[in-house]
Interface confidence: low
């Protein structure tokens, strides 16, 4: 019997979380020609393996090297789609634009998308009544270390011209706190990368403003700028009709041009 | 860097109580074990109870049960053990000990505070 | 309650020498116990967690082996600094208890 109760502040293990990150790994292997090779109960062990038996605020980015190692996958240059508090927008487009990709379109993010997980130190067993909340707990808990050790590998192996959507309804069009913001901006290589393009997604139906002028967004102009990697800035105006002209791009209303340029 | 910065020395009558406080710094108070262990003069080490401070949860070694208090106030990241009915025997260093914990309550202790000494003495 | 009892209770050993520490558990404690070196004047610090995993920022030369009940701690090559004296804890069972403690003295 439990003589003290592990309570955290976030909420616990999504249920069902082996299963569901085992039916993944076996959907995508069978979708994805490539990762044909990839055995899912070896995948399952190393995530299992991460953090089964960790006290969750001790977790680190050496805990995931095993499973990152077996799910090692390439992005074609000028593939790579990063995203900022926009994931809903971004996945819809990568779903029409088959030949780009987010983070979740890969393997290890597609197993990990919108579950949460944690175990307990010493004992075998998976929490599911509570995990370390990042804010009100710590930083360094299961899912947010797999994250960051995700993102900055997925940043690493980028190549050529790399697009980023940002959220331009939120105060922080660019946020240095942000996955985006701390871990894929300085892991970009910029022996690799020649240019990083943002895309800056406007919510409101009447807005023309040029959020490519925000301060935020000169100030990843400037950081980026300063890693040698070239920066380049575009307003949607539109996302409805962006994912519309995505779709299709034959659309006589799309022909146009849809896209508000500035190139800096 | 993770602090545990203990209160100073006392001296106590017998029969009398006193409370030592554990004020921590550098890390998150609230996701850690507090415990407290004692050594007498020459001896070893021997750990009387703890406190979750995020859930207010406490357990003693049976030695102690019904003399020790823990209490945590989260507010300050200060933790609390409070020994009544003393007798010489309690003279001792006491050391609050941070630890991380499951829900079986196994820890270790990764952080120290410099320690208390109390003295019961008539 | 478990009963740790280590030895031996002083040990003599010359500065780069090997020094090997037991303990034992009156019963299996399975690999949930620690190691704490004390100076005189100072709190206890952790060395090894897990019967063998080093606490950060431990240098190599300390290692820990053994489950169940028969445990050891090894320091390699005894520095100036490592003279002092060391515990063992079990936290597999309720109260966790330490060892009496092995003193590490220069010979």
């Known amino acids: 019997v439990p003589r003290w109760r592990q309570q955290w502040s976030g909420s616990g293990t999504t249920s069902r979380f082996p299963e569901t990150v085992l039916a993944r790994c076996v959907k995508y292997t069978e979708v994805h020609p490539e990762m044909r090779h990839v055995d899912c109960q070896s995948v399952w062990d190393a995530f299992k393996g991460a953090f089964i038996s960790k006290y969750p605020c001790n977790i680190t980015e050496e805990d995931y090297q095993p499973l990152v190692k077996l799910g090692t996958q390439t992005v074609p240059c000028n593939k790579t789609l990063l995203w900022s508090r926009i994931k809903d927008l971004a996945h819809q487009f990568t779903q029409v634009q088959r030949d780009m990709f987010t983070l979740e379109d890969m393997l290890l993010g597609y197993l990990a998308d919108d579950l949460t997980w944690c175990g307990e130190f010493n004992t075998f067993e998976i929490n599911y009544q509570s995990c370390p909340d990042w804010r009100k707990d710590c930083s360094n808990n299961p899912v947010s270390v797999f994250w960051k050790t995700v993102s900055r590998r997925f940043a690493e192996t980028a190549c050529g011209v790399v697009h980023v959507m940002l959220n331009g309804s939120r105060s922080k069009i660019f946020d240095k706190n942000s996955t985006f913001g701390s871990v894929e901006v300085h892991n970009l290589q910029p022996e690799k990368v020649q240019a990083l393009e943002a895309w800056v997604i406007h919510g409101g139906r009447e807005d023309s403003r040029d959020l490519c002028q925000d301060p935020t967004i000169k100030e990843l102009e400037s950081i980026i700028s300063k890693r040698n990697i070239r920066f380049f800035c575009k307003n949607i105006y539109r996302p409805d009709k962006f994912l519309q002209c995505v779709k299709n791009p034959e659309d006589s209303s799309c022909l146009s041009g849809i896209h508000h340029h500035h190139h800096h | 860097q993770v602090q545990l910065v203990q209160s100073g020395a006392e001296v106590k009558k017998p029969g009398s109580s006193v409370k030592v406080s554990c004020k921590a710094s550098g890390g998150s108070f609230s996701i850690y074990a507090i415990s407290w262990v004692r050594q007498a003069p020459g001896q070893g080490l021997e750990w009387m109870g703890g406190?979750?401070?995020?859930?207010?949860?406490?357990d003693y070694a049976q030695k102690f049960q019904g003399r020790v208090t823990i209490t945590a106030d989260e507010s300050t990241s200060t933790a609390y053990m409070e020994l009544s009915s003393l007798r010489s025997e309690d003279t001792a260093v006491y050391y609050c000990?941070?630890?991380?914990?499951?829900?079986?309550?196994?820890?270790?202790?990764?952080?120290w505070g410099q320690g208390t000494l109390v003295t019961v003495s008539s | 309650e478990i009963v740790m009892t280590q030895s031996p209770a002083t040990l003599s050993v010359s500065p780069g020498e090997r020094a090997t520490l037991s303990c034992r558990a009156s019963?299996?404690?399975?690999?949930?116990l620690a190691w704490y070196q004390q100076k005189p004047g100072q709190a206890p610090r952790l060395l090894i967690y897990?019967?063998?995993t080093r606490a950060t920022g431990i240098p190599a030369r300390f290692s820990g082996s053994g489950s169940g009940t028969e445990f050891t701690l090894t320091i390699s090559s005894l520095q100036s600094e490592d003279f002092a004296v060391y515990y063992c804890?079990?936290?597999?069972?309720?109260?966790?208890?330490f060892g009496q403690g092995t003193k590490v003295e220069i010979k």
């Open positions: 000990a941070r630890g991380p914990y499951d829900s079986y309550g196994e820890s270790y202790f990764d952080y």
């Open positions: 804890q079990q936290y597999n069972n309720w109260p966790w208890t």
């Open positions: 019963q299996s404690v399975s690999s949930n």
């Open positions: 897990g019967a063998s």
């Open positions: 406190i979750i401070p995020n859930s207010g949860d406490t």
